[in-house]
Interface confidence: low
């Protein structure tokens, strides 16, 4: 009865089980009768990260500049090469292909969140008693300033855009 | 047009700190990266790290580690590099350099800074 | 960290002379090298960009070549204001690396 299944890092070849490669190397040869599975290492720049019967070694990925990426972790024999966005910039996907600008967050809205290399700038509306009068990927949202602490009253209300306006208090006439 | 404007020359004792600026003008400070690159007597260039003003985030060359210490004041626009207990190997022209966020090179350089380190 | 090495340490060329100054990487860099000019006294001074790429306010002169692990900067027809050291840089990975440099001097 020819065998259908192997053990775990085992590979079928001719109703025969081969050892499989290790992580960092390629298959040369299968197993032969008593010879066992020949591997090679894989060159600079590639690389096989499971246990397996690949002929060929995967290439590094690429950070490509023009893309605004950088090497984050050099690739080994075992592992790829991880991308990151240079700073500024943050990945357009899940698999950090390329790169885009952080998002500002207009007057109005304050950053909630600073944007890393892999996520963008998250904004949130100022609420009543703060403000910003910028365009950011930095600023939050500003307290109004008090009038009453600094001896002022109030001239001009504040938005969610502008700071309150201060003036002196009103001379009591005798 | 962009200028990287240095501290002038430092003549200091072993052990002691220094502390060195880089004042840009001429570009949105906070959008580019700043680097900073040693220069020993006679010598190449050897990168010392960056700093990116618009976050504050560093990377360093491990061996400056515990060496150097790169700040930013986006306020004056100006790069700081603190180098610490400092020795004859110190004794070095230090450049600080900008690079943008991509496709750059290190395309606008200061004029140097002498740092002699000597009792 | 990535060593870049660079022939011959000094180059000696007549003036009108084609010259070439070569950088090696220890490992694949793809085209992420910079070569800069440093007069005597002077700060650094981009030439090329990512292996090719020219440089706004370079003379037409100043060109380069290569990926991978060897590149090339060449001068097609020096000038005697091109005395100086060149270096090759990586960006490819941290830390940033530079060449050792090679001297133009003028016969």
């Known amino acids: 009865e020819p065998r259908t299944a192997c053990r775990e890092k085992q590979y079928l070849v001719d109703s025969q089980c081969c050892n499989m490669c290790p992580p960092g190397e390629k298959l040369v040869n299968d197993c032969l009768h008593t010879i066992d599975t020949e591997c090679t290492r894989c060159q600079t720049g590639e690389f096989l990260d499971t246990w397996n019967a690949e002929r060929h070694c995967h290439q590094h990925k690429y950070c490509d500049p023009n893309l605004g990426l950088h090497v984050e972790k050099e690739g080994t024999s075992e592992t790829d090469t991880t991308c990151t966005c240079d700073e500024g910039l943050h990945c357009t996907n899940a698999a950090c292909e390329s790169c885009t600008m952080h998002s500002l967050c207009p007057p109005g809205l304050g950053v909630k969140q600073i944007a890393t290399g892999i996520s963008d700038t998250i904004c949130d509306p100022c609420p009543i008693g703060f403000f910003s009068n910028v365009s950011s990927a930095l600023e939050k949202c500003h307290p109004w300033t008090s009038c009453e602490t600094k001896g002022l009253v109030k001239v001009q209300a504040g938005t969610n855009k502008t700071d309150v306006i201060c003036g002196p208090q009103p001379r009591l006439r005798a | 047009q962009v200028q990287l404007q240095q501290s002038g020359p430092e003549l200091v004792k072993p052990g002691a700190s220094v502390k060195i600026s880089c004042k840009a003008s001429?570009?949105?400070?906070?959008?580019?990266?700043i680097h900073w690159v040693k220069q020993s007597p006679g010598q190449g260039l050897e990168w010392i790290g960056w700093?990116?003003?618009?976050?504050?985030?560093?990377k360093y060359n491990e061996k400056f580690k515990g060496k150097a210490t790169l700040t930013a004041d986006t306020s004056s626009s100006t790069a700081y590099m603190q180098l610490s207990s400092l020795t004859s190997e110190d004794s070095a022209v230090y450049f600080c350099?900008?690079?943008?966020?991509?496709?750059?090179?290190?395309?606008?350089w200061g004029q140097g800074t002498s740092v002699t380190v000597s009792s | 960290d990535i060593l870049l090495t660079q022939s011959p340490a000094i180059l000696s060329v007549s003036p009108g002379e084609r010259v070439s100054f070569s950088c090696r990487a220890s490992?694949?860099?793809?085209?992420?090298i910079h070569w800069f000019q440093q007069r005597t006294n002077g700060s650094p001074r981009v030439l090329i960009k990512?292996?090719?790429q020219s440089i706004s306010g370079i003379p037409s002169r100043f060109s380069g070549s290569g990926s991978g692990t060897d590149f090339t900067l060449s001068i097609n027809s020096v000038e005697s204001e091109d005395i100086a050291d060149y270096y090759c840089?990586?960006?490819?990975?941290?830390?940033?690396?530079f060449g050792s440099g090679t001297k133009l001097a003028i016969k």
């Open positions: 350099a900008r690079r943008g966020t991509t496709r750059d090179a290190l395309d606008y």
């Open positions: 001429g570009y949105s400070f906070t959008s580019y990266y």
């Open positions: 700093i990116f003003p618009g976050s504050g985030n560093t």
């Open positions: 490992q694949s860099i793809g085209t992420s």
């Open positions: 990512y292996a090719s």
């Open positions: 840089q990586q960006s490819y990975t941290w830390p940033f690396t």
